[in-house]
C-alpha cells in the first residue's frame, strides 16, 4: 500500500530513509539532455523473499541528442501522487541496510541519472530527521516518522524534533547538557545526529551510523 503523502517536513531539518521497505518504487529519472532508454524501466522496485531484498529493474539513461526533444523524464500524472524527492550528493552507504529484513539499501547511482530521486514509499516506511547545518536540536524527541495505515487512510507520524538557530538557550539548574556529538564538537556547531539513544533503530545500525547517512538530502 503506497503512502498518500510525503513525510512531514520539520523546520530547519532534513529526513532520510536508512533503508527502503519492499514495495518501494524509485522513478527512473534522467538528467537534462538524457532520457530513459527505449523499452527501459519506468521505475525500480524493491522486492524480495524472506531472506533477501533487492531492487528489480535497472534504470538506464541515454543521450537525447539524437532525438528532437531534450525534455527531462518526469513521472506520469498518476505517478505524481507519491513524489519523494532527494538530491543525490553521494553514493556512500555507511550502513549495511540489507541487514534489515524486508528492506532494500539505497540503490547505487546509474549513469546520467537526475539530481533528484523520486521515491514512492509504502506503509511501514520509516524516515529519520536531523537538523540542518547551523541549527541544533532544542528538543530531540522521537526524530523519525513512520507511514501508518489508520481507518483505511495512510498517515505519517509527527516527528518531535525542534531545530533552533538560537545558540544561547536557557537551561534550568541541576540538569546536564546533552552529550556533544560523536565527533566531539559542541552541538551548536554541528548537525544534530539521530544516532542517540533516543532512537531504537537497530543496535548494530546505531553503532555504525555517522553523519554521512544524511549525505542524501531530502527536499
Amino acid at each position: 500500500e503506497l503512502c498518500d503523502d510525503d513525510p512531514p517536513e520539520i523546520p530547519h531539518a532534513t529526513f532520510k530513509a536508512m533503508a527502503y521497505k519492499e514495495g518501494t518504487m524509485l522513478n527512473c529519472e534522467c538528467k537534462r539532455g538524457f532520457r530513459r532508454i527505449k523499452s527501459g524501466s519506468l521505475y525500480m522496485l524493491c522486492t524480495g523473499n524472506s531472506s533477501h531484498s533487492s531492487w528489480d529493474n535497472q534504470c538506464q539513461c541515454t543521450s537525447s541528442a539524437t532525438r528532437n526533444t531534450t525534455k527531462q523524464v518526469t513521472p506520469q500524472p498518476e505517478e505524481q501522487k507519491e513524489r519523494k524527492t532527494t538530491e543525490m550528493q553521494s553514493p556512500m552507504q555507511p550502513v549495511d541496510q540489507a541487514s534489515l529484513p524486508g528492506h532494500c539499501r539505497e540503490p547505487p547511482p546509474w549513469e546520467n541519472e537526475a539530481t533528484e530521486r523520486i521515491y514512492h514509499f509504502v506503509v511501514g516506511q520509516m524516515v529519520y530527521y536531523q537538523c540542518v547545518q547551523g541549527y541544533r536540536a532544542l528538543h530531540r524527541g522521537p526524530a523519525e516518522s513512520v507511514c501508518k495505515m489508520t481507518h483505511g487512510k495512510t498517515r505519517w507520524t509527527q516527528p518531535q524534533l525542534i531545530c533552533t538557530g538560537e545558540m544561547e538557550t536557557s537551561q534550568f539548574p541541576g540538569e546536564e547538557k546533552p552529550q556533544a556529538s560523536p565527533e566531539g564538537r559542541p552541538e551548536s556547531e554541528t548537525s544534530c545526529l539521530v544516532t542517540t539513544t533516543d532512537f531504537q533503530i537497530q543496535t548494530e545500525m546505531a553503532a555504525t551510523m555517522e553523519t554521512s547517512i544524511f549525505t542524501t538530502e531530502y527536499q
Epitope: 512531514p8 530547519h12 528538543h139 518531535q160 538557530g165 538560537e166
Partner: antibody, heavy 115, light 107 residues
Framework: QVQLVQSGAEVKKPGASLKISCKGS????????MHWVRQAPGQGLEWIGV????????IYAQKFQGRATMTVDKSTSTAYLELSSLRSEDTAVYYC????????WGQGTTVTVSS | DIQMTQSPSSLSASVGDRVTITCRAS??????LEWYQQKPGKAPKLLVY???TLAEGVPSRFSGSGSGTDFTLTISSLQPEDFGTYYC?????????FGQGTKLEIK
C-alpha cells in the same frame, strides 16, 4: 489517554512572583517539548516559550526573556512556568501545550494580578 | 518576528453553510501552520497541523490548505457545535505566533 493537568487559579499582587505547574500523563513525557501560551481576558493567544522536557533547554519570546523561567521535573512528568515582577497586564489564563503541533493543551490556569 | 493575519475577524453563518477562514503570514512559512478551535472558557483544540493534515478525531468537514504565506481553513458544512474562535499559528521559527483569531457565530 493523554492529559495535561495544570495547577489551580492564583491571585497575586503586583511585583510578586508566580509558579504554575503542568503535569503530563498518558504518554512518555520526555518525548514531547512543552510550550507555554497565555490569553488575556477577551484577547488572543500569546506564545511565551518552549522547553525541552528532555534536556531542559528553553527558548522564550523576547517579551518574556528575563522575567519568565520554564523548568521541568522529569521524575514527576511536570513542567513549570515561573513569572516574576508581576504586573496587572499579566492577568491572563496560562496554558501548557504539548509537542511540535500543540496537539494537547492543559485546561488553563487563571492568574489575576491586582492590588 | 513573523506576523500572522487572519480574516475575517468575525463572521456569522448558518448551519450547512460552507465557511472559509484565511490566514496570511508575513513571510514564507512553508507548510508549518496549525489551526485551532477555542470555545469560551475552554483550552484551544488542534484541528489541522502542517497546513493540511487533520488532527485525530476531527470531523472530515474541516480541511486545511495553502503553503508559503496564504492558508485557508474550510468547514464544508457548518454544524451548530462549530461556533467558537479559530486561530492559526506557525511553527516555522521561534517565536511561534498566532493570528488574532476569527470569531465564528452561528446564525
Amino acid at each position: 489517554q493523554v492529559q495535561l493537568v495544570q495547577s489551580g487559579a492564583e491571585v497575586k499582587k503586583p511585583g510578586a512572583s508566580l509558579k504554575i505547574s503542568c503535569k503530563g500523563s498518558g504518554y512518555t513525557f520526555t518525548d514531547y517539548a512543552m510550550h507555554w501560551v497565555r490569553q488575556a481576558p477577551g484577547q488572543g493567544l500569546e506564545w511565551i516559550g518552549v522547553i525541552s522536557t528532555y534536556s531542559g533547554d528553553a527558548i522564550y519570546a523576547q517579551k518574556f526573556q528575563g522575567r519568565a523561567t520554564m523548568t521541568v521535573d522529569k521524575s514527576t512528568s511536570t513542567a513549570y512556568l515561573e513569572l516574576s515582577s508581576l504586573r496587572s497586564e499579566d492577568t491572563a489564563v496560562y496554558y501548557c501545550a504539548r509537542g511540535v503541533t500543540f496537539d494537547y493543551w492543559g485546561q488553563g490556569t487563571t492568574v489575576t494580578v491586582s492590588s | 518576528d513573523i506576523q500572522m493575519t487572519q480574516s475575517p475577524s468575525s463572521l456569522s453563518a448558518s448551519v450547512g453553510d460552507r465557511v472559509t477562514i484565511t490566514c496570511r503570514a508575513s513571510q514564507d512559512i512553508s507548510n508549518y501552520l496549525e489551526w485551532y478551535q477555542q470555545k469560551p472558557g475552554k483550552a484551544p483544540k488542534l484541528l489541522v497541523y502542517n497546513a493540511k493534515t487533520l488532527a485525530e478525531g476531527v470531523p472530515s468537514r474541516f480541511s486545511g490548505s495553502g503553503s508559503g504565506t496564504d492558508f485557508t481553513l474550510t468547514i464544508s458544512s457548518l454544524q451548530p457545535e462549530d461556533f467558537g474562535t479559530y486561530y492559526c499559528q506557525h511553527h516555522y521559527d521561534t517565536p511561534y505566533t498566532f493570528g488574532q483569531g476569527t470569531k465564528l457565530e452561528i446564525k
